[in-house]
Interface confidence: low
């Protein structure tokens, strides 16, 4: 049978020929009658065999990391017979490892993100180096990790390459760190080879900073003419955190202002001071509000950083605007009796300059020929007034600042003209009546009514009478109905168209005014030729002709 030991050849041998070992047949008695042959990959090129002795030599420098073993076949032939002495057999030559490879970090570049202020021991990242040497051969591939750069904030576990935090870090002081890790083989013993890698460790932000106002006191100004909703200025706080952690909300502390509000511009993180209610320089010329600022998002576990909100004081000055004169009342109503003489007193309007300088005021009336106003606001008449022409006057009074004529205010003034009894009552219409020749006594000829252009204080009451002449010699009589109407009745039987075709009756109408006024009104009564039923015949023709303006004989 075949006789050999396990074959090893060290890698990286520089000699031209290195004895690996010997294989032989136990039938070989050393008389050189056997011939040994080597077959397989590497035979003849990497390994050769001494055909007589069976000694194997490596004739090439070997690299275990390229090829760690060779499987070869051996033959032995009896040269006298040419026959195989032993069956062909496979054998293995192992390339034994030397520490000729340094550890390499294959997953470079390394980058890790860890929250700032993370506690000691927090895992950051694991780095792993590879060593091409034989892990089963001694310590050639047994690695130890150490930190070359990164103290005192980081540490590395020697056997695992796990990087951990060893000291709290503040992103606001430094937001990234370069850590250099070394891996050494031979577990760090003499002759060890090493490799290094860099790890970029970025600190992610946590909300460990509250926003703080840039200024402890802000001064803003607002015009008293500014409408509600006007932005009067901005305030700004700074937060050393970033992103969502730097988003903030501004507010007025303890809601101490009904006049101003603060809204937050979430794009610029500014506080915008808004006018909530119109201001008046003459009422209050400056305001003070205290504003506070807080982060929009704060986690419960980070509340300790946000216990007391930053505050600032805002002093707001109101800018005076020249305002138009201000009337004491929004409108005025005055009364004056009709028929009072021109220059009569109507009433007084009053306007003042609301500004501090208190400019004198000038007054005027827009488009009025009936009234006048002086610089004291006194309104007088320029003509006598007649209530029956106009009972009310709607005036527009303008007040102008003496030193700034552009500052103008106008208000309506209503003047009521009060009635006096200056009109007697009169017929409410033109009356033209007729009576038949054959009319009997007491026949109703006409019902009359009256009107009075004066305004009734309570209710008009009219009194109807015939004139003295007509009372004494009248063919007609009058009865007052006591309801502002009266009836005219015949006072005799029979009338003659030929003798007296027309009667003119004077009727006196008095009112109940103080003093009472009386008017004389003429009632025309035509005598008509009537048939037996009382229907007028000639009279109708006459009336028609009269109404058309023709005179009948």
């Amino acid at each position: 049978g075949w006789v050999w030991n396990q074959f090893f050849v060290p890698e990286e041998m520089n000699t031209t020929s290195h004895h690996v070992g010997r294989l032989r047949s136990d039938l070989d008695n050393g008389n050189n009658s056997f011939q040994y042959k080597l077959l397989g990959a590497g035979a003849g090129s990497t390994f050769i065999i001494d055909e007589r002795t069976g000694d194997i030599y490596a004739i090439e420098k070997l690299d275990r990391e390229e090829r760690s073993l060779y499987i070869l076949r051996a033959q032995v032939i009896d040269i006298t017979t040419g026959r195989a002495v032993e069956p062909e057999s496979e054998f293995v030559i192992k390339v034994s490892d030397i520490n000729d490879n340094e550890p390499k970090f294959l997953d470079e570049p390394y980058e890790a993100i860890v929250p700032e202020m993370s506690p000691e021991g927090t895992l950051v990242i694991q780095v792993t180096a590879s060593d091409a040497d034989d892990p089963s051969s001694g310590n050639n591939a047994r690695l130890l990790y150490s930190l070359l750069q990164g103290q005192p904030y980081f540490s590395v576990e020697p056997t695992t390459g796990v990087i951990r935090i060893s000291s709290k870090m503040d992103r606001e002081l430094q937001d990234e760190y370069w850590v250099i890790i070394q891996a050494k083989d031979m577990i760090g013993q003499p002759g060890a080879l090493s490799g290094t890698t860099s790890v970029l460790i970025k600190l992610s932000d946590v909300n460990d900073n509250k926003p703080i106002f840039k200024e402890s006191l802000y001064r803003l100004t607002v015009s008293e003419s500014a409408p509600t909703g006007t932005s009067i200025g901005t305030i700004m706080a700074y937060d050393n955190d970033i992103g969502e952690n730097a988003e903030m909300d501004y507010s007025i502390e303890e809601d101490d202002s009904q006049t101003f509000d603060i809204i937050t511009n979430h794009e610029t993180q500014e506080g915008i001071v808004i006018l909530k209610k119109k201001v008046n320089f003459e009422h209050q010329n400056h305001y003070g509000i205290r504003a506070k600022v807080k982060n929009h998002h704060v986690d419960e576990q980070l509340m300790k950083y946000h216990t007391e909100a930053s505050t600032t004081f805002i002093k707001i000055q109101v800018e005076d605007v020249d305002e138009p004169p201000l009337f004491l009342l929004p409108y005025y109503i005055f009364e004056i009796f009709e028929e009072t003489p021109q220059g009569s007193f109507v009433g007084v309007v009053s306007a003042t300059d609301p500004d501090n300088r208190k400019s004198p005021i000038r007054y005027s009336i827009t488009r009025s020929k009936v009234f006048n106003i002086d610089d004291n606001g006194t309104i007088t008449t320029t003509n006598s007034l007649d209530r029956e022409i106009s009972a009310w006057y709607n005036l527009s009074i303008t007040a102008t600042e003496k030193y700034n004529i552009e500052q103008i205010s106008s208000i309506p003034v209503y003047v009521q003209v009060l009635n006096i009894n200056d009109h007697a009552p009169e017929f409410s219409q033109y009356y033209e009546s007729y009576v038949c020749e054959n009319a009997g006594s007491g026949q109703v000829i006409q019902t009359i009514s009256a009107v009075d252009r004066d305004e009734s204080i309570e209710e008009h009451h009219f009194y109807f009478n015939l004139s003295v002449e007509d009372t004494n010699s009248s063919s007609f009589t009058i009865i007052d109905n006591q309801d502002n109407t009266a009836v005219i009745l015949t006072n005799r039987t029979g009338f003659n168209l030929q003798e007296e075709p027309i009667f003119y009756i004077s009727i006196l109408i008095a009112d109940n005014g103080i003093p009472s006024l009386t008017s004389t009104n003429t009632l025309t009564i035509h005598v008509c030729d009537c048939d037996d039923s009382g229907s007028t015949q000639t009279c109708q023709y006459q009336e028609l002709m009269l109404s058309m303006g023709f005179k009948t004989e």
Partner: antibody, heavy 119, light 107 residues
Framework: QVQLVESGGGVVQPGRSLRLSCAAS????????MDWVRQTPGKGLEWVAV????????YYADSVRGRFTISRDNSKNTLFLQMNSLRVEDTAVYYC????????????WGRGTLVTVSS | EIVLTQSPGTLSLSPGERATLSCRAS???????LAWYQQKPGQAPRLLIY???SRATGIPDRFSGSGSGTDFTLTISRLEPEDFAVYYC????????FGQGTKVEIK
Amino acid sequence: QVQLVESGGGVVQPGRSLRLSCAASGFSFSSYDMDWVRQTPGKGLEWVAVIWYDGSNKYYADSVRGRFTISRDNSKNTLFLQMNSLRVEDTAVYYCARETGEGWYFDLWGRGTLVTVSS
Amino acid sequence: EIVLTQSPGTLSLSPGERATLSCRASQSVSSSYLAWYQQKPGQAPRLLIYGASSRATGIPDRFSGSGSGTDFTLTISRLEPEDFAVYYCQQYGSSWTFGQGTKVEIK
């Protein structure tokens, strides 16, 4: 005439208190915001505190906040500065000053009163 | 806070000469809220200029102020004997801060 007169200054030990007064005359005291300003050889002029015309708002410099209190009595035309927990660095001449109505600069100053904090 | 730096520290001039005092702010002073004061030994400061360029009541027209933003100047066109004093600038746009002063002395 229009004037401000301070009083109440003196020598005091650190940690002790002092109350300064400022008497106003010749103008409508209740219409003006009033301030205290101090002057030290080392730091020059330094604003200390302000109080609104009606006493509704008060504001302090960071260096004195929590220790000093500004107040006023409009019926007596007097401004006060209560100084507690005094420190050596509070040694200065203290002036009361009137703020103008239309701005925030000081158009009227008192002659000042010296406060010395020394052990 | 806004820091005001005055220069020069001391200005030695003769009566009748022109004095130019500078005041520089560490950041822009809003709306030219800058005032100048004069202080004589043992006296309170006296307001000279407000709003960077407006003369206070009763101040002679030889005193003038100019500037905006961060650079301001007080000019005394012809120095009178009573003008020799210490001059302070003050900003009132953001809280109140004063410059360290410029002493104008007789040469």
